[in-house]
């Protein structure tokens, strides 16, 4: 019934609204810090800098279909996925080119959506049902945020007023996880 072949990574047919891409696993918050480790302090960063504009994170483009019950968007929408790693911007181009990636020694920085945009999409429905229009929220840009901890809970804080923007026009190489696999996971999430 409906778009039978349109399934998520659990191979179950999506029965409801399918708008939001799932955040990559490393972006899920609620990771609490064991206060016995590091004396409750964030781990040392080898490339500590006071200039927030030197920090950057990667924007990966992907396309996905939007679903609503049995209906699916006529065309896929293009959206950004914000990579979970943040590092000094000056290292990114060369390091990525060499296949190396600067990694902080702890989960203190996150690359997360900064701005969103709304896009209206036309949904096609099976069985002669009239097409539907939906307005979806899509990630428009990414930023670095620092993860601060208090009361043993995680919270994301802005890493500066104007968080560092990734360099435009560069196509970073995906990490060990292939872009295709990443797209498959994200494409059909809610």
């Amino acid at each position: 019934q409906g778009w039978q072949a349109f399934k998520n990574d659990a191979t179950e047919i999506i029965p409801e609204l399918g708008e939001y891409p799932e955040p990559p696993p490393e972006l899920e918050n609620n990771k609490t810090m064991n206060r016995a480790e590091n004396g409750g302090r964030p781990p040392h960063h080898p490339f500590e800098t006071k200039d927030v504009s030197e920090y950057s994170c990667r924007e990966l483009h992907f396309t996905r279909y939007v679903t609503d019950g049995p209906c699916r968007s006529a065309k896929p929408v293009t959206e950004l996925v914000c990579s979970g790693q943040c590092g000094p911007a000056r290292l990114l181009p060369n390091a990525i080119g060499r296949g190396k990636w600067w990694r902080p020694s702890g989960p203190d920085f996150r690359c997360i959506p900064d701005r969103y945009r709304a896009q209206r999409v036309q949904l096609l429905c099976p069985g002669g049902e009239a097409p539907r229009a939906r307005k979806v929220r899509l990630v428009a840009s990414c930023k670095c945020k620092r993860l601060t901890r208090f009361h043993n809970q995680s919270e994301l804080k802005d890493f500066g007023t104007e968080a560092a923007r990734p360099q435009k026009g560069r196509k970073p190489r995906p990490r060990a996880r292939s872009a295709k696999a990443n797209q498959a996971e994200l494409e059909n999430a809610y």
Partner: antibody, heavy 116, light 111 residues
Framework: QVQLVESGGGLVQPGGSLRLSCAAS????????LSWVRQAPGKGLEWVSV???????YYADSVKGRFTISRDNSKNTLYLQMNSLRAEDTAVYYC??????????WGQGTLVTVSS | DIALTQPASVSGSPGQSITISCTGT?????????VSWYQQHPGKAPKLMIY???NRPSGVSNRFSGSKSGNTASLTISGLQAEDEADYYC???????????FGGGTKLTVL
């Protein structure tokens, strides 16, 4: 089916703290934006806060710096930590699922009373 | 601060049609952003009735319809029934897509 169940409301003194929970089921919790919306007795609805799938948080000016929204994706639970509570925070607090820029499912609400 | 303005109350007889308006600034109900409508019976949680100006969720009667002209959105209920008596709220989102605003609510009385 989608279900949202709030808990944690009660009577608290001004300046006190309270943590609300919202247990969710019936949908892919970690992929949705989730909000808290409140309603003071006899008054209208007021949006309080939202948390994105990435854990980024946004607040209404009236609660900024006092309330903290968070989520535990492993428990399918949304939280609202409320500190420095004031009499004007007295309300029924609803958690709501945000889909396609509107709230398509709401919990039944939990009453928070701030009074000495 | 952006605000959505609704009439405090409207009334109608069974079988009649009524319209509830929701007026705001161009940044919250103009061409950029869309409006949703919620119904709330006393002591109950709000229920989504209309979204994206004129879309009805499944299960909502086709007696409910929405429209928008300029910076005013409207909810029309045709063929009024006793169970339609409730409070109705319009809502929209901020330009950043990360905040929301509600109208003050309209009490609908079915005479």
């Amino acid at each position: 089916q989608v279900q949202l169940v709030e808990s944690g409301g009660g009577l608290v003194q001004p300046g006190g703290s309270l943590r609300l929970s919202c247990a969710a089921s019936g949908f892919t919790f970690r992929s949705h934006w989730l909000s808290w919306v409140r309603q003071a007795p006899g008054k209208g609805l007021e949006w309080v806060s939202v948390i994105t799938p990435y854990g980024d948080t946004y607040y209404a000016d009236s609660v900024k710096g006092r309330f903290t929204i968070s989520r535990d994706n492993s428990k399918n639970t949304l939280y609202l930590q409320m500190n420095s509570l004031r009499a004007e925070d007295t309300a029924v607090y609803y958690c709501a699922r945000d889909t396609y820029l509107h709230f398509d499912y709401w919990g039944q609400g939990t009453l928070v009373t701030v009074s000495s | 601060d952006i605000a959505l303005t609704q009439p405090a109350s409207v009334s109608g007889s069974p079988g009649q049609s009524i319209t509830i308006s929701c007026t705001g600034t161009s940044s919250d109900v103009g061409d950029i952003n869309d409006v949703s409508w919620y119904q709330q019976h006393p002591g109950k949680a709000p229920k989504l009735m209309i979204y994206d100006v004129n879309n009805r969720p499944s299960g909502v009667s086709n007696r409910f319809s929405g429209s928008k002209s300029g910076n005013t959105a409207s909810l029309t209920i045709s063929g009024l029934q006793a169970e339609d008596e409730a409070d109705y709220y319009c809502s929209s989102y901020g330009e950043s897509l990360t905040s929301y605003v509600f109208g003050g609510g309209t009490k609908l009385t079915v005479l």
